[in-house]
């Protein structure tokens, strides 16, 4: 029996009865917040073999092992994850072992086992046999291994029953509990699962099977389940669903889930029954079950009940996230804000069409309107008094409307009005008239030539770069010395630079009048020698990274025909040289036979160039005789924590303690102080723990149902 769409068992342990007939949980399983310690021995769910999403256990008092509850849980598919995890065991006060001795596969996601004060048998499980990558597993804050004394079956009697594998250079027995080994299939099966008798399953089986080489005898399917058979792909007229089974069109058409209730129903796309069309696709008609590609960004129509939407903060802009067509009028009134330009772009950057008018007034925080980076049409179906559909009034720092070289904007109906924008050059407004098709609509007073641009360098000369030199982390550039009509008016230069993976940046990107700026700025004084060209060495740059650079001349306010002259360069794109890559990450090695090692790693976080190959070096090491000195299988030899009469913990040590050697002196001394990198790593770790805990609490603490 398939149970779904996710089972949440909380407060009352008797709710576990809901799992009685489940063989597959299509969705997640939460068992949490059972504060009264109960006897779980009478609860056993041997039918449950698969959870398609994730398993979360949190604060369940009295539960000592999961093995009795779920003796046959074989696969957790991780189709949807809980904060990147498919198995979360958090603050389980009485859990002594995980005990899921039939768990063979976690298809996607990692595991997080944290703050379980009594939990042992963690180091005896080889998670690499269950998960593809163990590097993202997070196992901290549980019972210290030294206090556990984990013994696999038979080791006390010196008749070990479990198989051995290597984890972190430690070759050891693998088990779930004191009487349950971790199952491993014969190497002859390769990646295939196997039966209890070590016979290889059919390739389409996952985890285990009841009979060898039979696609109807699988405990779980590697790919998809349909009509009792594990299949590599869904048969004709059936569709993939929830990542594990095949369903027909009728089933898909009739799904009404709590998650999808507001949508128009599930769709069939690319052979899958899914909640919504994927990114880049839209329904082929409002009630259609099929998707077609969008031309450009997928349309999302947003409507304002009160006709006019006032954007006076990031919060109000947030309501427009994803909107491509705005039915109504936009009134932008941004007086202040932090990182406002990029926040507005994030939330309003997809708007293509405004059906009414756009009014920008008293927006002293804005330097540019480029945050409306996809606006291409203002219909002007509703206009302001005076028939204005684009109205720009009293914006003290507005310098740019849009980058007209890369912008097509049409104003279908209505006029434009500009007044009291002291840093907005009239030439910029005239350019907008041409691009938008409004030239000739405006009357004389609609674009005020005296109070627009009165405090801006509107007549700009072009500065030309003369040379560029690069190394792995430096750029040296020089440019022509600018000579204004009166040389005393030139004060200095400002160089602006930033990382630019693509050649599409503009001067006003991410810039606002409140101090946020995506550009780094460096002031460059005039060289005292008039014949030397000004230049700068930019250092501390990243290797193999493209930067955008431009230079502005800083001039005195020099009025000429009521306007200020200035000079700036075009934007120059320049890439630093390649360098040595950082070290490869997460290097893991394991032996799969007596003569082979398998080594895996992830690419370096900083390739610093185009990676072409890796070099793997190895050397034979002498066997460590220390491993043979003690019989670790006998209980009394395991170091047991004792408590001294004083306040210090003493651990029994079976050989001389190793002393730290600091600096050049050979002798015992205190541990070296932590490096900045270590301190930073610890800080990030603590932060990550907090973020996860907040996510957990926010996800599971919900108002009590009626």
């Amino acid at each position: 029996e398939i149970c779904g769409p996710g089972i949440d068992i909380r407060n009352d342990y008797q709710q576990l009865k809901r799992l009685e007939n489940c063989t597959v949980i299509e969705g997640y399983l939460h068992i949490l917040l059972i504060s009264k310690a109960e006897d779980y021995r009478s609860y056993r769910f041997p039918k449950l073999t698969v959870i398609t999403e994730y398993l979360l256990l949190f604060r369940v008092a009295g539960l000592e092992s999961l093995g009795d509850l779920f003796p046959n849980l074989t696969v957790i598919r991780g189709w949807k994850l809980f904060y990147n995890y498919a198995l979360v065991i958090f603050e389980m006060t009485n859990l002594k072992d995980i005990g899921l001795y039939n768990l063979r596969n976690i298809t996607r996601g990692a595991i997080r086992i944290e703050k379980n004060a009594d939990l042992c048998y963690l180091s005896t499980v080889d998670w690499s046999l269950i998960l593809d990558a163990v590097s993202n597993n997070y196992i901290v804050g549980n019972k210290p291994p030294k206090e556990c004394g984990d013994l696999c079956p038979g080791t006390m009697e010196e008749k070990p029953m479990c198989e051995k594998t290597t984890i972190n250079n430690e070759y050891n027995y693998r088990c779930w509990t004191t009487n349950r080994c971790q199952k491993m299939c014969p190497s002859t099966c390769g990646k295939r699962a196997c039966t209890e008798n070590n016979e290889c399953c059919h390739p389409e089986c996952l985890g285990s099977c009841s009979a060898p080489d039979n696609d109807t005898a699988c405990v779980a399917c590697r790919h998809y389940y349909y009509a009792g058979v594990c299949v590599p792909a869904c048969p004709p007229n059936t569709y993939r669903f929830e990542g594990w089974r095949c369903v027909d069109r009728d089933f898909c058409a009739n799904i009404l889930s709590a998650e999808s209730s507001d949508s128009e129903g599930f769709v069939i796309h690319d052979g899958e029954c899914m909640q919504e069309c994927p990114s880049g696709f839209i329904r082929n008609g409002s009630q259609s079950m099929y998707c077609i590609p969008c031309e450009g960004p997928c349309p999302k129509v947003c409507e304002e009940e009160k006709k006019t939407k006032t954007i006076d903060s990031v919060t109000s802009a947030q309501m427009l996230q994803g909107c491509t067509i705005f039915k109504g009028n936009l009134l932008i009134n941004i007086r202040r804000g932090n990182n406002i330009a990029s926040e507005l772009e994030n939330f309003m950057g997809l708007i293509e069409v405004v059906t009414g008018y756009v009014k920008i007034r008293h927006s002293h925080a804005l330097v540019s309107l480029s945050f409306l980076k996809n606006l291409r049409l203002i219909l002007g179906e509703e206009q302001l008094e005076g028939n204005y559909s684009f109205y720009v009034l009293d914006n003290q720092n507005l310098q740019q409307l849009w980058d007209w070289d890369h912008r097509n904007l049409t104003i279908k109906a209505g006029k434009m009005y500009f007044a009291f924008n002291p840093k907005l050059c009239v030439s910029e407004i005239y350019r907008m008239e041409e691009v938008t098709g409004t030239k000739g609509r405006q009357s004389k007073g609609d674009i005020n030539t005296r109070n627009n641009g009165e405090r801006a360098s509107c007549e700009s000369d072009v500065l030309h770069f003369t040379s560029t030199t690069t190394s792995k982390n430096r750029i040296i550039i020089t440019w022509h010395r600018y000579r204004p009509p009166d040389y005393r008016d030139l004060i200095s230069f400002t160089v602006y630079y930033k990382e630019a993976p693509f050649k599409n940046v503009t001067e006003y990107d991410g810039q606002d009048a409140c101090g946020s700026n995506s550009w780094n700025m460096v002031d460059v004084d005039l060289p005292p020698n008039k014949d030397v060209e000004p230049g700068i060495l930019l250092h501390g740059l990243k290797p193999w990274t493209q930067y955008a650079v431009y230079v502005k001349a800083v001039t005195l306010t020099m009025v000429e025909n009521d306007h200020i002259r200035g000079a700036k360069s075009e934007i120059l794109y320049i890439r630093t040289n390649a360098s040595v890559p950082s070290i490869p990450l997460d290097v893991l090695s394991a032996s799969n036979s007596s003569s082979q090692l398998i080594v895996k790693w992830n690419p370096p976080s900083l390739p610093n160039g185009n990676l072409s190959y890796y070099i793997v070096r190895w050397q034979r090491q002498p066997q460590d005789g220390y491993l043979y000195r003690h019989n670790y299988c006998s209980k009394d030899k395991i170091p047991i924590r004792k408590y001294a009469d004083g306040t210090i913990d003493i651990e029994e040590v079976t050989e001389n303690p190793k002393t730290e050697v600091c600096g050049g002196e050979k002798g015992p001394c205190c541990a070296c102080p932590k490096t900045e990198a270590e301190k930073q790593a610890e800080k990030e770790e603590a932060e990550y723990r907090k973020v996860f805990e907040n996510f957990l609490h926010n996800s599971i603490f919900v108002p009590r149902p009626e």
Partner: antibody, heavy 117, light 112 residues
Framework: QVQLQESGPGLVKPSETLSLTCTVS?????????WNWIRQPPGKGLEWMGY???????NYKPSLKDRITISRDTSKNQFSLKLSSVTAADTAVYYC??????????WGQGTLVTVSS | DIVMTQSPLSLPVTPGEPASISCRSS???????????LQWYLQKPGQSPQLLIY???NRLYGVPDRFSGSGSGTDFTLKISRVEAEDVGVYYC?????????FGQGTKVEIK
Amino acid sequence: QVQLQESGPGLVKPSETLSLTCTVSGYSITGGYLWNWIRQPPGKGLEWMGYISYDGTNNYKPSLKDRITISRDTSKNQFSLKLSSVTAADTAVYYCARYGRVFFDYWGQGTLVTVSS
Amino acid sequence: DIVMTQSPLSLPVTPGEPASISCRSSQSIVHSNGNTYLQWYLQKPGQSPQLLIYKVSNRLYGVPDRFSGSGSGTDFTLKISRVEAEDVGVYYCFQGSHVPWTFGQGTKVEIK
């Protein structure tokens, strides 16, 4: 895989309240769908009575509105029908059924309730 | 309430012959979203109803292709191209477009 099972007394006295419970297995009633009660008087046609949705909202047939209550117990994954002031005209086979976006896809096997003194 | 009227109420048929059941609604059952939520159910003796057709003409996966549905607005028809013995039972049309949802009074199909 989804199963619905009606339960409750087979005999109710006139003017009393008829109470039935539908136990759902294989799907959480809070996870989605509309959970309905439908009845069929002996030898007659089907009559839709009302539903409770996955989020707990109700919809009832107007002619029954004053007498009907459909509620749920999410911890037991059950939903219930209460019909007050019953008369002989309420004698019927009562079905619980699940309705999705388009149709009824799962039905209980039905339970006969007789109203008689 | 929307009244669903079926005809005939009784339909004796010969195996292998075609059969047709009509269902009329007292007003249009086109939903505001453009869909028409009209279904046909078959109730065999002693069983719960089972779905045959949804949204006027969509045959449920696994239902024999001798069953077909058609119609629009207020007039709908269920056709069986060649009746078989297993098709006996009471056929109900049902509208789920407007609350309260309503069933037709049923058409009893029996073998002559």
